[in-house]
Interface confidence: low
């Protein structure tokens, strides 16, 4: 599979239930573990922080206890376990530990983990929320005035928001330079499409949307083939039924269907 | 202990310096004030640390203008890149110079880098189908205001437009929406007091263009003339995928 | 792809200078740290100095502190090594080395990279003789 | 500093054996341990990192270990290609320091 490097981590829960959030700030001899939560429109907080040396938690006073418990499956690794969750526990949760920097200096700057979503909620959700694909292929316009052509994945019906996608090559694993939109929510779940255009040069090879994303089947990153394509010129016989839809650029529906 | 930073978003163009305001509230003193940056993927890059007993710090194109007596640290975003765009912490750290200090956060400050002014650029439209799925693809434009408009007589649903910079420091924009009768849809942009339309755009020639996917050993095109293309979308890691020409 | 290319090796007499270079490609000298390690003829490997680009930090094995000094000019994309008061027993083969990243935030809580080096140069031969 | 004592400097062994090369650390250094192999002149080349993870493209029946301060080096089957010097590293701590070298000669 594909590797997508970087934040867009996340973790949905049901009311009630307990959440593990791993940190990936990966610190060697770190004495203290600080967990922090960002909720949007409001500042980051502490919530406690983790001694190593004595295996001991502090919580951030007003915090009840029995609610934060960071979890150290072996050395230099921790997870935070929270229990009994509320929807108001949803949000970016942060590790962090202080880098000492120069050791002539008492401390230098705090350094953060990339962050995990936790989204906590009471929606019934369909059992699969895994990002739906449908592809657009260029259309023949473009092609034949810019000598440039735009790919378009369109993902749907997926849940939560947190979503990567980039794209490559086929036999390529360097990231092209792409765009998207906003994740849009529709009813309880969200769309989202990003596009790329190449050169014409580039239209005769396959090209590969790649979607990170929670709920992917199996955990692993979806890939999208975009064939490649190339410009035709075909005669048409205008009495031919089928000429309506002939101009149109080639239909490839993708659909999804649960299992 | 307080931290307030009271421009909630600020927007600039590249090239240009942008200052982001931050007041602070405390008893102590001596402190330390950080600069965060956020990322849209959510990770928070460490940018600066201003000292309360030291000169203005500086790094690279990040400078702070630390006011002890005012409370206040102000940073400076010298010579804009649109990779700038993204939310920024103004943070106080305890006086302890302990492992064990917390970081009080402001709310954050969401800087939004636009391109540089320049002439005024008329797009391109072209659309995009399948199935009931149409895409108005918009490219190259100046100034960013447009308006996009998807006509059918049969509308489904439309989308929100992306309105996006483009590597060329223009704009570009992609409306979605779902209709009964795709083949018949349009696109029709206002955009500095002119309408463009898709069509405009069309190839006029006497035979019927497509684009299609290139043949491989997977990709077989029947003869007949008026073909759909069939593609093979390899689809291991996507749930019962089915693909209709 | 990854290079390291060290140059300015030779002979030199005891007491003079020498300014060894490493030029890097494929990657930044200001996002990584480099390193140098000798090996004198037929002897075993010996850690010389690293610098952090970044922050500017250097540091040096005991034997030649106040006599090297690492810097990096990170528009040329190269580290030197600049050896005054040279001695025989500084007679080695110079190589200059790049830490491995294998985790997108590594840091040790003394503020340099904790990681072990991964791309080397070819080396460069320094012999101090008169 | 830390010293990296290193056993044994030298040993021969056949193509298909079992060879172990042990580091002892004189203080603590985490899993900040690194194994090398150098052939005559040629630069070093990365085997295991973090004491015992494998280095990509390293071939597998190369493999390490910690117990306390005592770091170990295992080839579990001897290729003609595995015969060179083998250096064991600290990188926890300043100044790096290096093992004295493991020869590996043909029996």
């Known amino acids: 599979s594909s590797n997508l490097e970087g934040g867009t981590k996340s973790v949905t829960r049901p009311t009630r239930s307990s959440a593990e959030i791993t940190c990936d700030l990966t610190v060697i001899n770190a004495f203290y573990i600080h967990w922090y939560l960002h909720q949007e429109g409001k500042a980051p907080q502490r919530l406690l922080y983790y001694d190593v040396s004595n295996s001991k938690d502090v919580l951030e006073s007003g915090l009840s206890p029995g609610k934060y418990y960071t979890h150290t499956p072996r050395r230099w690794s921790w997870i935070l376990i929270l229990r009994n969750l509320i929807e108001n526990d949803s949000g970016v949760y942060y590790c962090a530990t202080w880098d000492r920097g120069n050791p002539k200096t008492h401390y230098y700057k705090k350094l953060f983990g990339s962050g995990t979503t936790l989204v906590v909620t009471d929606k019934q959700l369909d059992a699969d929320v895994s990002p739906k694909p449908t592809i657009f292929l260029p259309s023949i316009a473009e092609t034949k005035l810019q000598k440039a052509g735009t790919y378009l994945c369109l993902l749907e019906k997926f849940f939560p928001d947190v979503i990567k996608i980039h794209w490559q090559e086929k036999k390529s694993n360097t990231i092209l330079g792409s765009q998207e939109g906003n994740t849009m929510k529709t009813n309880d779940t969200y769309m989202k499409f990003s596009w790329l255009t190449v050169p014409e040069k580039s239209l005769d090879k396959e090209h590969r949307c790649i979607v990170r994303h929670e709920n992917n089947k199996n955990g692993v990153d979806q890939e999208i083939i975009f064939p490649p394509i190339k410009t035709d010129v075909i005669t048409m016989d205008p009495k031919d039924n089928c000429s309506k839809d002939a101009n149109d650029t080639l239909l490839l529906q993708l659909t999804n269907t649960s299992a | 202990q307080k931290v307030t930073q009271a421009q909630s978003s600020v927007s600039m163009p590249v090239r240009k310096a942008v200052t982001l305001n931050c007041l602070y509230e405390t008893s102590w003193w001596s402190y330390y004030i950080f600069w965060y940056k956020q990322l849209p993927s959510k990770e928070m890059i460490f940018l600066i640390r201003q000292g309360s007993d030291e000169q203005n710090a500086k790094s690279g194109r990040y400078s702070v203008n630390f006011k002890k007596a005012a409370k206040s640290v102000a940073l400076t975003i010298s010579a804009l890149q649109l990779e700038d765009s993204a939310k920024y912490f103004c943070a106080l750290g305890d006086p302890g110079g302990l492992n064990t200090d917390k970081l009080i956060f402001g709310k954050g400050t969401r800087v939004t880098v636009e391109p540089r002014s320049q002439p005024h650029t008329k797009p391109s439209v072209f659309v995009m189908k399948n199935g009931t799925n149409v895409a108005c693809l918009v490219k190259e434009f100046y100034p960013k205001d447009i308006r996009i408009n998807l006509v059918s007589s049969k509308k489904i649903t439309e989308f929100d437009p992306a309105i996006v910079i483009s590597p060329s420091g223009k704009y570009n924009a992609v409306k979605l929406g779902k209709y009964e009768d795709s083949n018949s849809v349009t696109c029709s942009v206002q955009h500095d007091n002119k309408t463009v339309h898709s069509t405009d755009f069309e190839v006029k020639t006497d035979s019927t263009d497509h684009v299609k996917p290139k043949e491989t050993e997977n990709t077989k095109q029947p003869s007949k003339s008026c073909h759909k293309p069939k593609a093979i979308v390899h689809t291991e890691k996507v749930n019962m995928m089915s693909l209709t020409v | 792809e990854v290079q390291l290319v060290e140059s300015g090796g030779g002979l030199v007499q005891p007491g003079g200078s020498l300014r060894l270079s490493c030029a890097a490609s494929g990657f930044t000298v200001s996002s990584s740290s480099i390193h140098w390690v000798r090996q004198a003829p037929g002897k075993g490997l010996e850690w010389v100095a690293s610098?952090?680009?970044?922050?500017?930090?250097?540091y040096y094995a005991d034997s030649v502190k106040g006599r090297f000094t690492i810097s990096a000019d990170t528009s040329k994309n190269t580290a030197y090594l600049q050896m005054n008061s040279l001695r025989a027993e500084d007679t080695a083969v110079y190589y200059c080395a790049r830490p491995y990243y294998w985790y997108p935030y590594y840091y040790w809580s003394g503020g340099w990279e904790y990681a072990a080096f991964d791309y080397w140069g070819q080396g460069t031969l320094v012999t101090v003789s008169s | 500093d830390i010293q990296m004592t290193q056993s044994p400097s030298s040993l021969s062994a056949s193509v298909g054996d079992r060879v172990t090369i042990t580091c002892r650390a004189s203080q603590s250094v985490s899993s900040a341990v690194a194994w090398y192999q150098q052939k005559p002149g040629k630069a070093p080349k990365l085997l295991i990192y973090?004491?015992?993870s494998l280095y990509s493209g390293v071939p597998s029946r190369f493999s390490g270990s910690r117990s306390g301060t005592d770091f170990t080096l295992t080839i579990s089957s001897l290729q003609p290609e595995d015969f060179a010097t083998y250096y064991c590293q600290q990188y926890g701590e300043y100044p790096i320091t290096f093992g004295q070298g493991t020869k590996v000669e043909i029996k």
């Open positions: 973090s004491a015992s």
């Open positions: 610098i952090y680009s970044s922050s500017g930090y250097t």
